[in-house]
């Protein structure tokens, strides 16, 4: 009662391999790595057959089929390319994930190469079965920022795409009687978060209580160049308005806030985030040059008091920018202490500007980012936020602009952006 000699399947083997198989002998059919046993349209690792009493095998020898990982999953803000000809998805085939450059980059700087494993899954050496993450590229505008010194006071225009992180924040407080409307600037930190100054988002009350404006009253414009033409801009409503809990209206200490957008904004040449600095108390060093942009007052003949009294918020139609040097804390403190009025320059602030004046930020520029180029990382970093200035006119001699020192708040910002109160689980690269 011998059974016929067995031929192992292509890409497979039979164990045990014997010269003769008799009644009740069993053999196990298995496949090479990267192949699976195919029997009656079912896929399995091994298949057992037995030599029956009548000298026949209990089943036919199955075939070995190459493992197929199937079509790779799509990647948010990324794409997948096949490294193997004919877009093969079978064992040992390779694919490469990449992010939508230059607006997104891969987290952990992985190669993005995945191989179809013997288990039928696309696998990466580092990430194993997890997909890579495409994070927004920060602080790298698609057009290089020029070295020209321009001014916001009496200034010239910025070109579209020079400050892709720049946001116009419009607050229309309909809870007020009569309605109150004002604006400020902000800086995009990720697809869903805007960094700005707390005083921009504080309700303009008749007392000094710090109460944030309702989220329903906030509109954010991104990719905006000329405020008269908002057609090319992305506008978004706010999901949350978060003022720093210690913001003090009397001295503008802790003048920092966040807006979470209702929906993530698509990034592109005109909408890109700015980088946050490393958390360090020193802040930017004196004499370092920074850039700040805004739609605030650009007419040097109009006084701040005239604007406040008239109730209008005169603004520049086209985004303006200025290059300003950081001023030492001691010099700035001294310049304000010599003035009448209670002006305290705290450790959470730094100053920028020229002793001789002429270049400055002004009313309406509030909340915009003071950005400095970081040579090490080759990114622009938001070191400051336009906060306040002296009692004299913008650009006056020896009146420096005062900026919120962002590096003192990096931990608070990450905490808020990743808190469970955030509307969605939005990842931001640290």
């Amino acid at each position: 009662n011998e059974c016929p000699k067995l031929q192992p399947p292509v890409y497979g083997k039979i164990e045990p391999s014997q010269a003769v198989y008799s009644f009740k002998d069993q053999v196990l059919v298995s496949c090479d790595t990267g192949y699976k046993v195919l029997k009656d349209n079912g896929v399995m690792d091994t298949f057992q057959i037995e030599c029956l009493k009548d000298g026949a095998w209990s089943n036919k020898i199955p075939t070995c089929k190459i493992v197929d990982c199937g079509a790779p999953a799509g990647l948010k803000h990324g794409l997948v390319t096949f490294s193997t000809r004919n877009n093969l998805t079978t064992y040992k085939s390779e694919i490469r994930y990449s992010c939508q450059q230059p607006y997104y980059k891969m987290l952990h700087n992985t190669t993005g190469v995945y191989t179809c494993s013997a288990h039928g899954t696309w696998t990466n050496e580092v990430l194993k079965r997890s997909l890579p993450t495409c994070l927004p590229v920060c602080g790298q505008p698609s057009r290089a920022l020029p070295n020209l010194v321009k001014r916001i006071i009496g200034g010239r225009n910025a070109e579209l795409g020079l400050f892709p992180w720049q946001a116009l924040i419009v607050v229309e407080d309909t809870s007020r009687v009569p309605n109150d409307k004002w604006f400020g600037s902000g800086a995009l930190l990720s697809e869903s978060w805007i960094l700005t100054a707390a005083h921009v988002l504080r309700s303009q009350r008749r007392d000094n209580t710090v109460i944030p404006v309702s989220k329903e009253h906030v509109t954010v414009y991104l990719g905006l160049h000329d405020v008269r033409d908002k057609s090319g801009a992305v506008n978004s409503s706010a999901a949350r308005v978060i003022l720093h809990p210690d913001f003090n209206i009397q001295n503008y200490n802790h003048d920092i806030a966040l807006v979470q957008l209702q929906k993530p904004v698509p990034l592109g040449a005109h909408v890109m985030p700015i980088c946050l600095p490393r958390p360090e108390p020193e802040g930017p060093a004196p004499h370092m040059l920074g850039l700040v942009a805004g739609w605030g007052i650009s007419n040097p003949n109009v006084t701040v008091d005239e604007i406040i009294l008239s109730g209008t918020r005169t603004l520049s139609d086209v985004l303006q920018y200025v290059k300003l040097p950081v001023v030492s804390h001691a010099e700035c403190k001294a310049s304000y202490e010599s003035r009448s009025g209670n002006y305290s320059v705290t450790e959470n602030m730094f100053c920028a500007g020229y002793y001789e004046g002429g270049k400055d930020t002004c009313l309406g520029d509030s909340g915009g980012a003071f950005v400095i180029f970081d040579e090490m990382s080759q990114h622009w970093v938001a070191q400051g936020l336009v906060s306040w200035g002296g009692p004299e006119e913008c650009g006056s001699k020896q009146v420096y602009g005062v900026y919120t020192k962002v590096s003192n708040y990096v931990d608070w910002l990450w905490e808020e952006m990743n808190s469970p109160r955030a509307v969605r689980d939005l990842q931001v690269e640290r």
Epitope: V177, R206, N208, I249, D305
Partner: antibody
Framework: QVQLKQSGPELVKPGASVKLSCKAS????????INWVKQRPGQGLEWIGW????????KYNEKFTDKATLTVDVSSSTAYMELHSLTSEDSAVYFC???????WGQGTLVTVSS | DIVMTQSPSSLAVSAGERVTMSCKSS????????????LSWYQQKPGQSPKLLIY???TRESGVPDRFTGSGSGTDFTLTISSVQAEDLAVYYC????????FGGGTKLEIK
């Protein structure tokens, strides 16, 4: 139009408590605080405290921290002030105001008498 | 606590005259950052609720006649009625909102 309607006059015995109401209409109740002000007969105005309906935060004039309790019912857009341990010194007209004093209630006269 | 002192406590003027009344605070009510003085003026006519006239020391509340003008900064403030009308008979109060709220004692305006 904006209105703040206060509850009617109260005659209460010394040592008792009284709860005054102020119903708001015509504006966003939660986005504006409600202030309470006391005026004794023939005297000036005295600020008692304010309450902010959006988050329930309250600020009191120190003098009134043990005397008054401020609350709101957002569902009915109504603010309340309860006055405790009343004495003749508490006999006064009590006003509520809203939208940062742009609008005032008509006042509630509280008379404390045995 | 901030103390508010109003003067005079009362004054009598004829219709059409210009009148000024003063309000002094025990500390500055100016917040340099906002360039605002946190001081308001109220009018209370006999048997009525108070009415807001001026806030931020000089901003007229909507609907208030332009004969009412607020001025001053820091600790010294003035309410001016350029041409007094019979209906201006009232007590005028100032109030600070720099640190919580405090009312002044009031100035009673009588018409001769």
């Amino acid at each position: 139009q904006v209105q703040l309607k206060q509850s009617g006059p109260e005659l209460v015995k010394p040592g008792a408590s009284v709860k005054l109401s102020c119903k708001a209409s015509g504006y966003t109740f939660t986005s504006n605080d409600i202030n309470w002000v006391k005026q004794r007969p023939g005297q000036g105005l005295e600020w008692i405290g304010w309450i902010y309906p959006r988050d329930g935060s309250i600020k009191y004039n120190e003098k009134f921290t043990d005397k008054a309790t401020l609350t709101v019912d957002v569902s009915s857009s109504t603010a309340y002030m309860e006055l405790h341990s009343l004495t003749s010194e508490d006999s006064a007209v009590y006003f509520c105001s809203g939208v940062e004093d742009s609008y005032w209630g008509q006042g509630t006269l509280v008379t404390v008498s045995s | 606590d901030i103390v508010m002192t109003q003067s005079p406590s009362s004054l009598a003027v004829s219709a059409g005259e210009r009148v000024t009344m003063s309000c002094k605070s025990s500390q500055s009510l100016l917040i340099s950052r906002t360039r605002k003085n946190y001081l308001s003026w109220y009018q209370q006519k006999p048997g009525q609720s108070p009415k807001l006239l001026i806030y931020w020391a000089s901003t007229r509340e909507s609907g208030v006649p332009d004969r009412f003008t607020g001025s001053g900064s820091g600790t010294d403030f003035t309410l001016t009625i350029s041409s007094v009308q019979a209906e201006d008979l009232a007590v005028y109060y100032c109030k600070q909102s720099y640190n919580l709220y405090t009312f002044g004692g009031g100035t009673k305006l009588e018409i001769k």
